[in-house]
Interface confidence: medium
């Protein structure tokens, strides 16, 4: 009797950016929740967090540095990650606790998503490039 | 075995406090949300308050706000009711319930701790 979640198998942050979707098998419209996201295979590290309560508005925070927004759809959280180094690409799991009304639910583990950041070009291109080959 | 198991019930003047416990056993509080539930005769079973310990979100019924404090112990695998300035209508069997996810609703229930409010 746990809540299932869907998330894409992976996705690629060209711009230092991504938005990960988690679908969940439960409507969260008049609940009071918290969504996590949750980085590397043993869930270590909490990137971010968005508590919903359904007499105000969404709080969303990261604890652990992540530049983090959120956004809820009746059966969907999705997290906006802005700023990701090349060296955070890792598999995120999406994690969703109902704490009222009870009884208290939460999620069987999904099979997360691998998050390749793939990072800007830091070095600007030369204003004179050298004569092309012919 | 799981196991829930209140005490710190009594007798006690209007105005009055008490402090139940709620001691869990074979499974770890922090991986749920614990309620406290009162039955009183020819009253709607209530859930006064209640508790998710690993995170310490906590609810109160309208009718305790103010007067009843929740809390847990996770070292000690405990929750926790405080109620101050008791009234009369607070006399019931106070029960705490495990509210992890089951079909059933509550997943485990203690055996409950009288308390009578009366002068």
């Known amino acids: 009797n746990k809540i299932l979640v869907k998330q894409s198998p992976m996705l690629v942050a060209y711009d230092n950016a991504v938005n990960l979707s988690c679908k969940y098998s439960y409507n969260l419209f008049s609940r009071e929740f918290r969504a996590s996201l949750h980085k590397g295979l043993d869930s270590a590290v909490e990137v971010c967090v968005v508590y919903g309560n359904y007499s105000q508005q969404l709080q969303v925070y990261s604890k652990t540095g992540f530049n983090c927004d959120g956004k809820l759809g009746n059966e969907s959280v999705t997290f906006y990650l802005q700023n990701l180094y090349v060296n955070q690409t890792d598999i995120y799991f999406c994690k969703i606790e109902v704490m009222y009304p009870p009884p208290y639910l939460d999620n069987e583990k999904s099979n997360g998503t691998i998050i390749h950041v793939k990072g800007k070009h830091l070095c600007p291109s030369p204003l004179f490039p050298g004569p092309s080959k012919p | 075995e799981v196991q829930l198991v209140e005490s710190g019930g009594g007798l006690v003047q209007p105005g009055g406090s008490l402090r139940l416990s709620c001691a869990a056993s074979g499974f770890n509080i922090k991986d749920t949300c614990i309620g406290w539930v009162r039955r009183a005769p020819g009253k709607e079973e209530e859930l006064v308050a209640y508790?998710?310990?690993?995170?310490?979100?906590?609810r109160y019924a309208d009718s305790v706000k103010g007067r009843f404090t929740i809390s847990a112990d996770t070292s000690k695998n405990t929750a926790y009711l405080q109620m101050n300035s008791l009234r009369a209508e607070d006399t019931a069997v106070y029960y705490c319930?495990?509210?992890?996810?089951?079909?059933?609703?509550?997943?485990?229930w203690g055996q409950g701790t009288t308390v009578t409010v009366s002068s």
């Open positions: 319930a495990d509210h992890k996810n089951t079909q059933w609703g509550y997943a485990y």
């Open positions: 508790i998710c310990p690993s995170h310490g979100y906590t």
